[in-house]
Amino acid sequence: LEVQVPEDPVVALVGTDATLCCSFSPEPGFSLAQLNLIWQLTDTKQLVHSFAEGQDQGSAYANRTALFPDLLAQGNASLRLQRVRVADEGSFTCFVSIRDFGSAAVSLQVAAPYSKPSMTLEPNKDLRPGDTVTITCSSYQGYPEAEVFWQDGQGVPLTGNVTTSQMANEQGLFDVHSILRVVLGANGTYSCLVRNPVLQQDAHSSVTITPQRSPTGAVEVQVPEDPVVALVGTDATLRCSFSPEPGFSLAQLNLIWQLTDTKQLVHSFTEGRDQGSAYANRTALFPDLLAQGNASLRLQRVRVADEGSFTCFVSIRDFGSAAVSLQVAAPYSKPSMTLEPNKDLRPGDTVTITCSSYRGYPEAEVFWQDGQGVPLTGNVTTSQMANEQGLFDVHSVLRVVLGANGTYSCLVRNPVLQQDAHGSVTITGQPMTFPPEA
């Protein structure tokens, strides 16, 4: 019996679902009544999920795991882990026992993208050349620990007088605060780059300091230019900041978040206090940061339906607003491949290869190619169906006439995440059955 798992770690984003792939080669005449399948944590041997006595024995791991029951008979022992947490990171062992037995371990690497950094200055008023300022770059809710780089407007690295701290919250996600102390020149740009080493994702922000300041009193509302990309099920921060006047107090502040198109109220702050969420109780402000001009909104457990533009309106004596776009995304699962017919295949037969990938958003781009990487465009039909949550299941069907042998690959691309999920099937010339028998 051969048990196969991917060599590379499975990288899963916090809050999303991950598939830990595991397959075995069933013998002819194999029935599920013969199968024992055990998933366990490699290090502690804690039971995660099991299949025995012809039935799924369920999750022993926080009720967040599932098998693919319809695929077990074909040798697919993969485990679906839902709503991935940082604490899930590590090695999982897939143990298969029929008459023969075998096991293999697959590594789960958990990741969470860092938010676009917010930059603050101290002091932030009446700055003059020669003043020493502290620039703080803060990026939130990432994993694993970030690498932080500072540079000036010419791209020259700034390494002196930098202090970086990273604190994990209860979920194990890191908030990064990096402090740069500089002496101001006539003017200057300072950039902070926060890198997620696993995702190879860079989040950067910069601040340009022109020492002579504009007149006080005018409110400036700032939001990120780029859409905020949030994964379904995770929390998103819609950044919004304003420049409080000297002597500003929260009693003077009106802050309103609303949907840009419908003007539906989302969250508000007035009369010196947070008036709470008017949006499914999934929003929150950062009350401790409001007095410093941070009007950002936290949107919890992001759904596809949340996608769109949110307006941040700030009114003190002066007033202003700005809109920030939320782009929702969900990674597509590794495609599963099926053949029809799947028995006694011979050169010259016409087969239908179906590539299925699940629970992604937005709609995927699907590409087929042969073993030489040549695109296959003829006789391809792709359908995408959204479920109640708005996530898409993709089914792409390729009809081909078998040659002596051939490899057919299907690539499912998430255009927002630039995430590619691929599956392939190799069909050999001799009469065969799919999946191959032991």
């Epitope: 504009s214 003077q252 007035t270 309106f313």
Partner: antibody, heavy 117, light 108 residues
Amino acid sequence: EVQLVESGGGLVKPGGSLRLSCAASGFTFSSYGMSWVRQAPGKGLEWVAAISGGGNYTYYLDSVKGRFTISRDNAKNSLYLQMNSLRAEDTAVYYCARQGLRVMDNWGQGTSVTVSS
Amino acid sequence: DIQMTQSPSSLSASVGDRVTITCRASENIYSNLAWYQQKPGKAPKLLVYAATNLADGVPSRFSGSGSGTQYSLTISSLQSEDFATYYCQHFWGIPPWTFGGGTKLEIK
């Protein structure tokens, strides 16, 4: 003492244009948002447009959006309302008002706009 | 957009009377409401801001009250100079910052 003085009103034909001005004095102009409010003959007050202190945020009544433009020149302590494609229903006295803490705490004396053929 | 419904639209009263004008907002405006007085041919004058605060120089016979969607302006003892038209206006959220339809207070 805060003073707001409107000018630029007059008689104009439908489809025509006018530019209203409001000269401000007695306060730090760039620190305050400003609004235009109008009042048709024998009718109530109607908020028309607002502009933030720095001039970077503007808001309009739906019925004037695309026809009217509010702007300001902080160096000249002046507020403007450019009115294009004027209609009979735009006939009104137009007031400029200073925005205090979510209130219009000072008003000009108004300038009259008549749109008629 | 938020609608402001002011009532009554007109009111006859005598010097010394106590009168109350009300304003209803179509949604919670969290006390972001002002009251103005306007006399014929003149610009409006601020009376009350933030629902309950009297503007500088406004006599104490004027008072504002209310919260949520319901607000009122009360004149405790009418004086001859109080006969005018009164308007409420909300300042909640992104404009338009609409006015109520006005209440004309006339001498009985």
